[in-house]
Amino acid sequence: AQNITARIGEPLVLKCKGAPKKPPQRLEWKLNTGRTEAWKVLSPQGGGPWDSVARVLPNGSLFLPAVGIQDEGIFRCQAMNRNGKETKSNYRVRVYQIPGKPEIVDSASELTAGVPNKVGTCVSEGSYPAGTLSWHLDGKPLVPNEKGVSVKEQTRRHPETGLFTLQSELMVTPARGGDPRPTFSCSFSPGLPRHRALRTAPIQPRVWEPVPLEEVQLVVEPEGGAVAPGGTVTLTCEVPAQPSPQIHWMKDGVPLPLPPSPVLILPEIGPQDQGTYSCVATHSSHGPQESRAVSISIIEPGEEGPTAGSVGGSGLGTLALA
């Protein structure tokens, strides 16, 4: 059989070899495709619902006005010329659809060395057959499960069109001494040969040195965290990491419902503000890092130091973020 590839939605003409150029003709077409249960026979007379899918032209060729996925299969023509010589034509038809240009979505602008980082997700929509996605670093293919590279793939099929959507999520663990501005790209390779790959626009995240865990410092003002009623306590979370991570605050092990900020001000301290405070630094592509906990307590008039073991209620009082 002769292999024929046709683009979905495009017309296709299959020649019936040996058929007379004009009627009368003695020929028949047999089809075994996704539209047929077994072999379907089409004659030059045509007519009926099949004409919208495939019909025999006056010259004996078979014409499909818009090829679809269901038209994949075997097409055979048997023709007899004026002298009674029989000729057979045999075609294996495969269809394809080139997707739109693949895209990298949810791409990271920053990665951290020494830990797994999600670089991004490559998405290709509208291919047939499915094809494959592959990742490249500086134009060279990245091999999954090698040197800190892992890829999670997903293939979905559209329930109506039958076209495929491919997704590929790239995770990398940058090793020491690598390029601080690596160039990642992703390419779609069609499932049928003779079609060139489609490549995404590249992304160039920055790779940062990891932040040592012990570097999240919590500074309390006044020192010691003991304050008279109505006084102010300022908690500052110092993280030398660059770029600055997001800082959230915890009280007695519970996250405070406040927007991220490196400074927490507790003005007009009351009993409800007493407790143990810590800050949590969340670096992009890095696990959260918690500071040491500090105890904030109220010194009652006439007392010298923090009230032993005093932990106030769960109320927040008035909180200010700088």
Epitope: D138, A175, G177, G178, D179, P180, V207, W208, E209, Q242
Partner: antibody, heavy 119, light 106 residues
Amino acid sequence: QVQLKESGPGLVAPSQSLSITCTISGFSITSYGVHWVRQPPGKGLEWLVVIWSDGRTTYNSTLKSRLSISKDNSKSQVFLKMNSLQTDDTAMYYCVRHGGYFPYAMDYWGQGTSVTVSS
Amino acid sequence: DIQMTQSPSSLSTSLGGKVTITCKASQDINKFIAWYQHTPGKGPRLFIYYTSTLQPGIPSRFSGNGSGRDYSFSISNLEPEDIATYYCLQYDNMYTFGGGTKLEIK
């Protein structure tokens, strides 16, 4: 103690090629990138190329066609090759360690090797 | 490619005084600038990276500042060993040096 030492031919004839070696001690080139930078007499510094710990390379786009960088991890050596030399390639050539990922920059430099292009 | 314009190209100053050198990038370099001291017969020496972080062993008389496209490098209480040529380097995208500033004594 981190040390980088460049060695080269000193004199190169025009249109010939230049080969320089950087021999490294005090750190491993499997953990750090190494750059080549040059300085023509009386002029400023010009970055040429870098080879990263994994062997990947990044070149100055204007000189890429004439440059080639490679390394031998077992000997702790980095090599620079430059083709089709002209008189304006006369310069002091330095190899430089890259300090790490961001926010670090090039940190330790060799003392340089002088290259004169002349017939 | 990013261009770095360093000024002044030379600077005459007195010992004990303060000097400031500037570098202007052709685009935002996100604070990825380093400053090097270069004395004749030696390789350059890193003094500051990431705009303002002092390399270990560098005295606090040296400082760096800036953001976006504009950056500066200052030396206060100038000492004789500070006489050298200073270069800025942007390393945000590839690597570009400024033209250098030669520091001299009045």
